[in-house]
């Protein structure tokens, strides 16, 4: 069951998944310049069995002016986007290799891919957030969101984190000073 | 269930100071911030600021700072609004508020100053 | 500050009535918007927030929309219990601002 709505927006955070439960569909979407080729699918989806879980189909960009040349899904080093190593993003890197199961990791990126990743979430998927650079969480209670089912709706939790730009914190005298945060995910996603 | 619960009524002379409190219940006091909001006749709903439960670092309304104080007693599972040097102007309906949706609101404390 | 201008101030309507509630920021609030709804000598209830999400609980008559700048909350078939004061708030910065509020009275 697809989730109705997006994750929930979160002041100055961004939101990404660790792993995709089966069902999820990610848009082949392509950046200026080019489109998904003729014959290629509108989305990859993440299908499996009981033992493993992939993402089915490939996404292929081609220019939108040369017709005939198609690009590989493999992508050349230097297309890769540049990922800052945070906290979190090695979390997610332990997450990828502990697969869990009915779940796709992240896909690989592919050639000239458009720089925001749509995801179509299913019930039961959980996003987590994190301030964006430049902003601390001020509050971190449940930083994540679970789409679920209720009375024949879907909904997606609140999650309890609030970040903000100012620097200094306001503490009253005698509290310990909060961990500092990571500063912000390796990429935000959305969701349509 | 959820519940903030705030004391309804309080008469202070002008010039005191008056902590305000709002005890968490029926939740995990910790996982959700707790705003304060007063409510007066001349001003509608103000914002006052956002207190972590968990840290106690707070954030707060420019318009309220050197008036307002807010602090959490997390073995308690409460929050406080001291206010300070009162005037007759900071009579008003103060409210407890939680998360980032204010989900919850605690009943409000009704301030009156007057001598 | 952003400025949250609500529209109308007042408005009376009839149970079973349509009616909707227009808020406006002076800047861009995107979606972080909230919609409560508050009862004479009660608190504020929340309703709507992230502009269209329906709190839990709230009855599938009341509906919020927009982003950006402009904001409404509508209510189809109106029940006895819905009449009250309205007002929206902005969470994109602090500090956060409510609207001036709409009464909402019984024709």
């Known amino acids: 069951e697809l989730c109705d709505d997006d994750p929930p927006k979160i002041t100055h955070a961004t939101f990404k998944a660790v792993a995709y439960k089966e069902g999820t569909m990610l848009n082949c979407e392509c950046k200026r310049g080019f489109r998904r080729i003729k014959s290629g699918s509108p989305y990859m989806l993440c299908t499996g069995n009981s033992s493993h879980s992939s993402w089915d189909n490939q996404c292929q960009c081609t220019s939108s002016a040369a017709r005939n040349t198609t690009k590989q899904v493999t992508p050349q080093p230097e297309e890769q986007k540049e990922r800052k190593t945070t906290e979190m993003q090695s979390q997610m890197q332990l997450a990828d290799q502990v697969s869990l199961p009915g779940h796709c990791r992240e896909p690989p990126p592919w050639e000239n891919e458009a720089t925001e990743r749509i995801y179509h979430f299913v019930v039961g998927q959980t996003v987590y957030y994190q301030c964006v650079q430049g902003y601390r969480a001020l509050h971190r209670g449940p930083a994540e969101s679970v789409c679920k089912m209720t009375h024949g709706k879907t909904r997606w939790t609140q999650p309890q984190l609030i970040c903000t730009g100012e620097t200094e914190p306001s503490q009253f005298p005698g509290e310990e000073e909060p961990q500092a945060s990571p500063d912000g995910l390796p990429e935000s996603e959305t969701s349509r | 269930q959820v519940q903030l619960q705030q004391p309804g009524a309080e008469l202070v002379r002008p010039g005191v100071s008056l902590k305000i409190s709002c005890k968490g219940s029926?939740?995990?006091?910790?996982?959700?911030?707790m705003h304060w909001v007063r409510q007066s006749h001349a001003k509608s709903l103000e914002w006052i600021g956002v207190?972590?439960?968990?840290?106690?670092?707070?954030l707060y309304n420019q318009k309220f700072k050197g008036k307002a104080t807010m602090t959490v007693d997390k073995s308690s599972s409460t929050a406080y609004l001291e206010l300070a040097r009162l005037t007759s102007e900071d009579s008003a309906i103060y409210y407890c508020?939680?998360?980032?949706?204010?989900?919850?609101w605690g009943q409000g404390t009704t301030l009156t100053v007057s001598s | 500050d952003v400025v949250m201008t609500q529209s109308p101030a007042s408005l009376s309507a009839s149970v079973g009535e349509t009616v909707t509630i227009t808020c406006r920021a002076s800047?861009?609030?995107?979606?972080?918007l909230e919609w409560y709804q508050q009862k004479q000598g009660k608190s504020p209830q929340l309703l709507v927030y992230?502009?269209?999400t329906l709190a839990e609980g709230v009855p599938s008559r009341f509906s919020g929309s927009g982003s950006g700048t402009q904001f409404s909350l509508k209510i189809n078939s109106l029940q006895p219990e819905d009449f009250g004061t309205y007002y929206c708030q902005h969470h994109y910065g602090t500090p956060y601002t409510f609207g001036g509020g709409t009464k909402l009275e019984m024709k």
């Open positions: 508020a939680r998360g980032v949706t204010f989900d919850y």
């Open positions: 207190i972590s439960t968990y840290s106690g670092d707070a």
């Open positions: 800047e861009n609030s995107y979606s972080y």
């Open positions: 029926g939740y995990t006091f910790t996982d959700y911030a």
């Open positions: 992230n502009a269209k």
